[in-house]
Interface confidence: low
């Protein structure tokens, strides 16, 4: 490698002394503390002397030297005023450093009343000091002086001493940003490294480095390691980077220049379009996953999916990836056909082999409908029960049941319903229902409730009396009844054409009217019975009601 | 619809380790960052730690150095995080979330108990 | 390690007021601010990223503002459903994420 460059120290070490005074440099190798063999030594660029690694100088310029195991040392400028006052800097001085400044009279004992000047402003808290410290130094041109008073005999003569330019140095150089490639491939991994050199004579700071990208900081931000291995990159990746290295005390910072690093695409190649379920079967109902991958291809990639006779794309993805999923939730029918799949990365898509999907479709829930001459099914009617589910895949098995009884089965092998025929008989009401299956799993109907009714049969009437001979103020009682019929049944009582009354009877034994006779109930009595199929009328029976006489007349 | 399914709330030892899962769906596993994150009893919300699960590269938060392991297996598109050597600090409900600066998806999340 | 403060532990509000959660970090993180809004027993929900952005399918009664170290989550016309816990995460220095310590959104 490089040989480290000679460091040269001053004693006493002050970078300015009073004419006539020495000073004496001395020559320092980092790698063995004293120089070994000759040092060679220069004064304003000049070879001076090959010497030892230490000499006396008295003359004012810039003096270097090296070893033979180091490179040559950093210019040190030395002055020897011939002023009365003199401003001196401890050297080295490095940037950060706190630096203590000396204001010296020639006849420092006569010299009093010492103030330092920084760029002609009094520094603060520096009044009257031999020694002053100011912290923190950088490398900017800043002048310094100072101003004293010399006794004179019986006077005070002010004097300022010549401005020193401090000889501030590189604590550690301006960091270089290295990439391991300015022009990366996407998805592939780079490492930053961010270069300074710190100097030899100060091993012991400590620096950190924080890597950025744009206004964006990478890493962890402030890190030991002046490297970031960035595990894969993307073309938003892309952008200007720079770091920055600064000493753990915060002290000094600095910036590198930006570089600007362009991530690079690998274009789509190999488009498939793979199906789930594989071969593309599936039932409607089911999630269908439309797998569309590229076998090369980097960074952000656009995926669309595309149906035969559809003008617009299913989907659109664009993600950082070799492979995307179209997620189509509940196929239908319409869902069958010929699909392709696009990836584009670039300029222009890449398309996938056709892939044809089929669909089959579970039944849907089945109809069942009544199909019957009349409104209200009657005893002797014949009913069709006709179930029918409005989709799914032929063949379809149909079953009907009444209540929990299975009736019968039928098939309907190219789709559409299917019937079955009930002649009807009183014992035919009640819930009904059918299932359809085709393979694909069994649906249930809604329940649908028949009543089958029972028109009424001829109603008789009965007089019932007290006696065999109705007489006025008898209660006589007017029965009338069908045997047959379903309820309610509605009964209608009748004397000559007027009508007595009606009772709703829910249940079997007819119905009762009664009457408080006088002479008027004479005459022909009827009732009739409805239950909604047709009324029914009874016979006639003729009443005959005596005065005020106990003999009865009978009841024809 | 992407979904993180992470595994049931554990009951475990003090000085035991134990594995928590969470099975990724709705999209390509590989091409997301999975991160875990604990909130312990003060509801408090702590980054552990990142895996990529295209190559299995994971940057963990300090703090959890030696304390979680992460993982993934590609074929199952499931991240795994192994906590070791539990103590009574560790009890607290780990997520799984998807996101490689902020979290727009997130596990149920997955109560660690550490009882003796 | 930035540190993200959310100096009320708990807000009380009345339904249909406007309340506003704060969230301070110890150092510019620019708008690297994402809100989240947690229910008891269920795990957070995105509201808000870059700072003032509303994640897809958030009510527009959420709003985000600020950059730097001050950022704020403001909702309006709170609703019943809104109460729960908000916290704020900032990722400026990737990937040391860190969450503030939560404000919780109670009824008066």
């Known amino acids: 490698g490089v040989a480290p460059k000679a460091v040269l120290l001053l004693n006493p070490p002050w970078s300015t002394a009073f004419k006539g005074e020495k000073v004496a440099l001395i020559c320092s190798s980092i790698s063995h503390s004293l120089a070994q063999g000759d040092t060679y030594w220069y004064h304003d660029e000049k070879l001076l002397k090959i010497k030892h690694d230490k000499i006396q100088i008295t003359e004012p310029g810039n003096y270097q030297c090296k070893t033979r195991g180091s490179s040559l040392s950093d210019a040190v400028h030395v002055e020897f005023s011939p002023d009365w006052l003199i401003l001196q800097a401890l050297h080295p001085v490095f940037e950060g450093d706190n630096v203590i400044l000396r204001c010296q009279g020639k006849d420092n004992k006569n010299t009093h009343q010492k103030v330092y000047y920084k760029d002609g402003k009094q520094l603060p808290n520096s009044y009257n000091l031999e020694k002053i410290t100011v912290n923190s130094v950088s490398r900017d041109n800043s002048k310094y002086h100072c101003t004293a008073y010399r006794k004179f005999y019986i006077l005070d003569i002010e004097v300022t001493s010549k401005p020193l330019n401090i000889q501030v140095q590189e604590l550690f150089l301006h960091p270089v940003l290295r990439a391991s490639s300015s022009t990366p491939i996407e998805g592939s991994p780079m490492t930053l490294t961010c270069e300074t050199q710190l100097s030899p004579q100060r091993p012991d700071v400590q620096l950190q480095f924080s890597l950025f990208r744009d206004s964006q900081t990478l890493g962890l931000g402030w890190s030991r390691s002046p490297r970031l291995q960035i595990p894969a990159m993307w073309t938003e990746d892309s952008g200007s980077y720079w770091c920055e290295v600064e000493t753990v005390t915060h002290s000094i910072k600095k910036r590198s220049l930006r570089s600007q690093i362009r991530v690079q695409r690998v274009p789509v190649s190999n488009v498939n379009l793979e199906i789930r379920p594989t071969g593309g079967q599936l039932i409607e109902g089911e999630n269908m996953v439309l797998i569309c991958s590229v076998a090369q291809g980097s960074g952000t990639v656009t995926f669309s999916w595309h149906k035969e006779g559809r003008v617009r794309s299913l989907g659109r993805k664009t993600q950082r990836s070799l492979l995307a999923e179209l997620h189509v939730l509940t196929v239908k029918e319409s869902d069958a056909g010929r699909y392709y799949c696009a990836a584009d990365n670039v300029h222009s898509p890449i398309l996938s082999t056709w892939i044809r999907v089929t669909v089959r479709i579970p039944v849907s829930h089945p109809v069942l409908t009544f199909r019957a001459p009349r409104a209200h099914t009657v005893v002797g009617d014949l009913l069709e029960l006709h179930c029918e589910s409005l989709r799914g895949s032929p063949p379809i098995l149909y079953r009907f049941y009444h209540e929990d009884v299975t009736l019968g089965n039928s098939s309907a092998p190219s789709g559409g319903g299917a019937s079955f025929n009930l002649s009807l008989t009183a014992e035919h009401s009640g819930n009904y229902s059918c299932d359809a299956d085709n393979g694909l799993g069994a649906q249930h109907s809604h329940g649908v409730s028949l009543r089958v009714t029972v028109p009424v049969s001829r109603p008789v009437l009965t007089l019932r009396a007290p006696g065999a001979q109705a007489v006025v103020g008898d209660l006589l009682e007017l029965h009338c009844e069908s045997l047959r019929g379903s309820f309610p049944i509605l009964y209608w009582f009748y004397h000559e054409d007027d009508t007595l009354g009606n009772i709703s009877a829910h249940s079997g034994g007819g119905a009762s009217f009664n009457l408080s006779l006088t002479t008027e109930h004479s005459g022909n009595y009827s009732c009739e019975a409805d239950n909604g199929l047709g009324a029914q009328h009874s016979k006639v029976v003729t009443l005959n009601v005596t005065g005020t006489s106990r003999n009865r007349t009978g009841l024809t | 619809e992407v979904q993180l399914q992470q595994s049931g709330p554990e009951l475990v030892k003090p000085g035991a380790s134990m594995k928590i899962s969470c099975e990724a769906s709705?999209?390509?596993?590989?091409?997301?960052?999975m991160n875990w994150v604990k909130q312990s009893r003060g509801k408090n919300l702590e980054w552990i730690g990142l895996?990529?699960?295209?190559?299995?590269?994971?940057t963990y938060n300090q703090k959890f150095k030696g304390k979680a392991t992460l993982t993934v297996d590609q074929s199952s598109s499931t991240a795994y995080m192994e906590l070791l050597s539990l103590t009574s600090e560790d009890s607290a409900v780990y997520f799984c979330?998807?996101?490689?600066?902020?979290?727009?998806?997130w596990g149920q999340g997955t109560l660690v108990t550490v009882s003796a | 390690d930035i540190v993200m403060t959310q100096s009320q532990r708990f807000m009380s509000t009345s339904l249909g007021d406007r309340v506003s959660v704060t969230c301070k970090a110890s150092?510019?993180?620019?708008?690297?601010v994402a809100w989240y809004q947690q229910k008891p027993g269920q795990s957070p929900k995105a509201l808000i990223y870059?700072?003032?952005y509303r994640y897809s399918g958030v009510p527009d009664r959420f709003t985000g503002s600020g950059s730097g170290t001050d950022f704020t989550l403001t909702i309006s016309n709170v609703q019943s459903e809104d109460l729960a816990e908000y916290f704020c995460?900032?990722?400026?220095?990737?990937?040391?994420?860190?969450f503030g310590g939560g404000t919780r959104l109670e009824i008066k």
């Open positions: 979330a998807r996101g490689l600066y902020w979290f727009p998806y």
């Open positions: 709705g999209y390509s596993f590989t091409a997301y960052i």
């Open positions: 895996i990529n699960p295209y190559n299995g590269e994971t």
């Open positions: 150092q510019n993180v620019i708008t690297n």
């Open positions: 870059s700072a003032s």
């Open positions: 995460q900032q990722y400026t220095n990737y990937p040391m994420w860190t």
